[in-house]
């Protein structure tokens, strides 16, 4: 048998070997495809199948617009002028080249020593599904699950049967100061079909920088709490990788495990004081937050708020 590859939507002509080019012809075309359950013999007079597979006057079979459901086997049996039976057998596969792949949501830059999402490569409208590959500086990137991670997703359109592929690339660059170029290519895996490439993206790799800012958040707001209450201090840092955070109270380090959150449950007067956090980044010095003050006070110690109503129901003015 002969393997035939046809593009979806394009016509395909299969010749019936041995068939006389003009009637009278003794021939039979039959097909087993996604449109049939078993072999379907086509009527030489034509009929409802002509819209998908039609016998031409010369005995060839015309598929006016091949579709996914036309994949399968086509056979012709003809008797030539000398009375000898000649058989033709075709295995038809269809394909569709997708639109040019694109890298969506590309990174603006990368940070050394930490995982960075480079971007997501998207290919829409392929058949069969095909594959997406990433390239670094023109060389194929092989995902190792550690420094190079690829997350893939394949979806099929319920009506057209065509595929959409997505491939998300995450890398851990080893050093800063470089400018790697990433690209993505789609391949159908068919002979004589060149891969489709995205436009390359060139990204700067920077060393992990110092935190851009360090903020100390306190709950309850204002740092005033009743005895037995809970205080939560959160050290907010915008640095990658997240640095180690230590805590200082009244100028002295607290003997606690590093954590960006300090919880003070059931506070007493001994917890009062000035707190700050210190972020230590591997490649940079420590950075201290502005301090916050914690005060433990009975409610009402400061008197009612201005103009509030006391128990007598009369307004009091401080």
């Amino acid at each position: 048998g002969q393997n035939i590859t046809a593009r979806i939507g394009e016509p395909l002509v299969l010749s019936c070997k041995g068939a006389p080019k003009k009637p009278p012809q003794q021939l039979e075309w039959k097909l087993n495809t996604g449109r049939t359950e078993a072999w379907k013999v086509l009527s030489p007079q034509g009929g409802p199948w002509d819209s998908v597979a039609r016998i031409l006057p010369n005995g060839s079979l015309l598929l006016p617009a091949t579709g996914i459901v036309d994949e399968g086997t086509f056979r012709c049996r003809a008797t030539n002028r000398r009375g000898k039976e000649v058989k033709s057998n075709y295995r038809v596969r269809v394909y569709q080249i997708p639109g040019k792949p694109e890298i969506v949501d590309p990174a603006s830059e990368l940070t050394a020593s930490v995982p960075n999402k480079v971007g997501t490569c998207v290919s829409e409208g392929s058949y069969p599904a095909g594959t997406l590959s990433w390239h670094l500086d023109g060389k194929l990137l092989i995902p190792d699950g550690k420094e190079t991670l690829v997350k893939e997703e394949t979806r099929r359109h319920p009506e057209t049967g065509l595929f959409t592929l997505r491939s998300e690339l995450t890398v851990i660059p080893t050093q800063g100061g470089t400018h790697p170029t990433f690209s993505c290519s789609f391949s159908l895996g068919l002979p004589r079909r060149r891969p489709l490439n995205t436009a390359p993206i060139q990204l700067r790799v920077r060393e992990p920088g110092p935190p851009e800012g360090i903020q100390l958040l306190v709950e309850p707001e204002g740092g005033i709490v009743a005895p037995g209450g809970t205080v939560t201090l959160t050290c907010a840092i915008s640095a990658q990788p997240p640095p180690q955070v230590h805590w200082i109270k009244d100028g002295a380090p607290l003997p606690l495990a590093p954590s960006p959150v300090l919880l003070l449950p059931e506070v007493g007067h001994e917890d009062e004081g000035t707190y700050s956090c210190v972020a230590t980044h591997p490649s940079h010095g420590p950075q201290e937050s502005p301090p916050v003050s914690i005060r433990v006070t009975e409610t009402g110690d400061e008197g009612p708020a201005e103009g509030s109503v006391g128990e007598s129901g009369l307004g009091t003015l401080a």
């Epitope: 449109r35 049939t36 359950e37 078993a38 379907k40 009527s43 007079q45 034509g46 009929g47 409802p48 199948w49 002509d50 819209s51 998908v52 039609r54």
Partner: antibody, heavy 119, light 107 residues
Framework: EVQLVESGGGLVQPGGSLRLSCAAS????????MTWVRQAPGKGLEWVAS????????YYPDSVKDRFTISRDNAKNSLYLQMNSLRAEDTAVYYC????????????WGQGTLVTVSS | DIQMTQSPSSLSASVGDRVTITCRAS??????VNWFQQKPGKAPRRLIY???NLADGVPSRFSGSRSGTDFTLTISSLQPEDFATYYC?????????FGGGTKVEIK
């Protein structure tokens, strides 16, 4: 809205001729095969003719072959049935319908037009 | 030519009844069978296409099934508006062939 409207029916003598028309709207006419189906009074449905989307290929049952001709004008979104040598047994309501191949088979119908063959 | 033998030719049923109509093809027609409903003085309306698929806008009480060359239209719970004549159609080969019809009447 997808619509088919037949016209041209009427009373005709045996041996006479009549031309039916079907005006299509609401869809891309030249993407579809088209078909005529008839129904004699009090009887069932009978296929009369089909034509492919280009108009190059036509199909008929033996009962009307060589007497009826189906045609189409894609520029005018119109389907026609030329009926010659009419007989009493051709008396029926004639419907035009969209499709007729294995891809789309008679999914939309017109309201029908009555053809009476009588002397 | 393919024959489509439809049965019964008529039936009486009540609202809420389950109704089954069968068409048998004289040879293999694959999945290429439709079912139509026709009310007096109106054009046929397609209910089921390619043996088992419900056409747009058709209530889900209608369903189609196939076993070899036997095709079945089922109305799970007959409604007042379902009293009509039903036809099957084979469109695998020319001539396209309709079944003889089944008239569903009120008991």
């Amino acid at each position: 809205e997808v619509q088919l409207v037949e016209s041209g029916g009427g009373l005709v003598q045996p041996g006479g001729s009549l031309r039916l028309s079907c005006a299509a709207s609401g869809f891309t006419f030249n993407n579809y095969w088209m078909t005529w189906v008839r129904q004699a009074p009090g009887k069932g449905l009978e296929w009369v003719a089909s034509i492919d989307n280009s108009g190059d290929n036509t199909y008929y049952p033996d009962s009307v072959k060589d007497r009826f001709t189906i045609s189409r004008d894609n520029a005018k979104n119109s389907l026609y049935l030329q009926m010659n040598s009419l007989r009493a047994e051709d008396t029926a309501v004639y419907y035009c319908a969209r499709g007729g191949d294995i891809l789309v088979s008679l999914d939309v119908w017109g309201q029908g037009t009555l053809v009476t063959v009588s002397s | 030519d393919i024959q489509m033998t439809q049965s019964p030719s008529s039936l009486s049923a009540s609202v809420g009844d389950r109704v089954t109509i069968t068409c048998r093809a004289s040879q293999d027609v694959g999945i290429y069978v439709n079912w139509f409903q026709q009310k007096p003085g109106k054009a046929p309306r397609r209910l089921i296409y390619r043996a088992t698929n419900l056409a747009d806008g058709v209530p889900s009480r209608f369903s189609g099934s196939r076993s070899g060359t036997d095709f079945t239209l089922t109305i799970s719970s007959l409604q007042p508006e379902d009293f009509a004549t039903y036809y099957c159609l084979e469109f695998d080969e020319h001539p396209l062939t309709f079944g003889g019809g089944t008239k569903v009447e009120i008991k």
